[in-house]
């Protein structure tokens, strides 16, 4: 009785169960009555990452420097190359096919999380008591100056974009 289903790491062909090829190898011949499945290793710059019956290996991803990409992890016969972005850039998608410059946080916003090769800058509004007067991809919100610790008084209130202005205490009582 020919099988209708096969074990794990097997596939059904011509009414018989044949072994799949292991990761890093491609199928060159299905099994027969007289031979096992025949597999061959993937070539240089190729990979297959699963048990498979593929007749061609996949090409490793190319990290194109013209798109701001560089190799983060070199591919093997069983894994694809992982690309990341050059300094100052981050991936536009999870598959990292191209890069864009990190965004800067505008005045009134500070950096909550500095960008990486795969994620953009995360900005946050400066809360009361903090300010940012620059457009930056690195600067966090800074606290307003404490006039009291300098024996000074606030002459001009701070905002989310400006520091307080301190001045001498009024001597007249």
């Amino acid at each position: 009785e020919p099988p209708t289903a096969c074990r794990e790491k097997q596939y059904l062909i011509n009414s018989q169960c044949c072994s799949l090829c292991q990761p890093g190898q491609k199928l060159v011949s299905d099994c027969t009555e007289f031979t096992e499945t025949e597999c061959l290793p993937c070539g240089e710059s190729e990979f297959l990452d699963t048990w498979n019956r593929e007749t061609r290996c996949h090409q490793h991803k190319y990290c194109d420097p013209n798109l701001g990409l560089r190799v983060q992890q070199k591919g093997t016969s069983e894994t694809d190359t992982i690309c990341t972005c050059e300094e100052g850039l981050h991936c536009t998608s999870e598959s990292c096919e191209s890069c864009v410059p990190h965004r800067s946080c505008l005045p009134g916003f500070g950096v909550k999380q500095i960008a990486t090769g795969v994620s953009d800058t995360i900005c946050e509004p400066c809360p009361v008591g903090f300010f940012s007067n620059v457009s930056s991809a690195f600067e966090k919100c800074r606290p307003w100056t404490s006039c009291e610790t300098k024996d000074l008084v606030v002459q001009q209130a701070g905002t989310n974009k400006t520091d307080v202005v301190c001045g001498p205490q009024d001597r007249q009582r």
């Epitope: 097997q10 072994s19 060159v28 011949s29 007289f34 031979t35 096992e36 499945t37």
Partner: antibody
Framework: QVQLKESGPGLVAPSQSLSITCTVS????????VHWVRQPPGKGLEWLGV???????NYNSALMSRLSISKDNSKSQVFLKMNSLQKDDTAIYYC????????WGAGTTVTVSS | DVVMTQTPLSLPVSLGDQASISCRSS???????????LQWYLQKPGQSPGLLIY???NRFSGVPDRFSGSGSGTDFTLKISRVEAEDLGVYFC?????????FGGGTKLEIK
């Protein structure tokens, strides 16, 4: 039904190269591999190599430097080429289809002699 | 490479006798799938080899039931229960579990 027919030069001078053609019928080269085996006079069988359906090849490591196997799917022909022949390459050369080990060609006799 | 060792080299028999040929491999012929790819061929004088047995014990179609194969791992046997004149020739074992495929040196079955 499956048939294979080998054809070769018969006589080859030492240090010269050998070219043999295997013409197949009853099965398709784009979907099946073809193996080459040889048998020196009065001796055992030796597997030489295979060309798979997609054109990939495996060779006997002892002969790899002198051997190449190619094919022409459109003509249903497989070619064996061997360089730098010596007397001990004198043999009957057989081709057989992968998965058709019940069917061997009649073989072609190759004699290496000056 | 897997070395296939056949014994005896020559086997003189009388017609009607039982004949037994041994084939040993230098490493196990059991594939990770559990299958064992060991074949037996008969080459009659002036002819190409003909398949008798595949996967250790499966008789190829049209092969008489007086031929039987057995064994496992590295040790295999071909038995002919009652030798007939048409059985004379050279018997080869062959393994196709591991590339390169390899053959035994042959056993010549001849009349005493």
């Amino acid at each position: 039904q499956v048939q294979l027919k080998e054809s070769g030069p018969g006589l080859v001078a030492p240090s010269q190269s050998l070219s043999i053609t295997c013409t197949v019928s009853g099965f398709s080269l784009p979907t099946s591999g073809v193996h080459w085996v040889r048998q020196p006079p009065g001796k055992g069988l030796e597997w030489l190599g295979v060309i798979w359906a997609g054109g990939d090849t495996n060779y006997n490591s002892a002969l790899m430097s002198r051997l190449s196997i190619s094919k022409d799917n459109s003509k249903s022909q497989v070619f064996l080429k061997m360089n730098s022949l010596q007397k001990d390459d004198t043999a009957i050369y057989y081709c057989l289809g992968h998965g058709h080990f019940d069917v061997w060609g009649a073989g072609t006799t190759v004699t290496v002699s000056s | 490479d897997v070395v296939m060792t056949q014994t005896p080299l020559s086997l003189p028999v009388s017609l009607g006798d039982q004949a037994s040929i041994s084939c040993r491999s230098s490493q196990s012929l059991v594939h990770s799938s559990g299958n064992t790819y060991l074949q037996w061929y008969l080459q009659k004088p002036g002819q190409s080899p003909g398949l008798l047995i595949y996967k250790v014990s499966n008789r190829f179609s049209g092969v008489p039931d007086r031929f039987s194969g057995s064994g496992s791992g590295t040790d295999f046997t071909l038995k002919i229960s009652r030798v007939e004149a048409e059985d004379l020739g050279v018997y080869f074992c062959s393994q196709t579990t591991h590339v390169p495929w390899t053959f035994g040196g042959g056993t010549k079955l001849e009349i005493k």
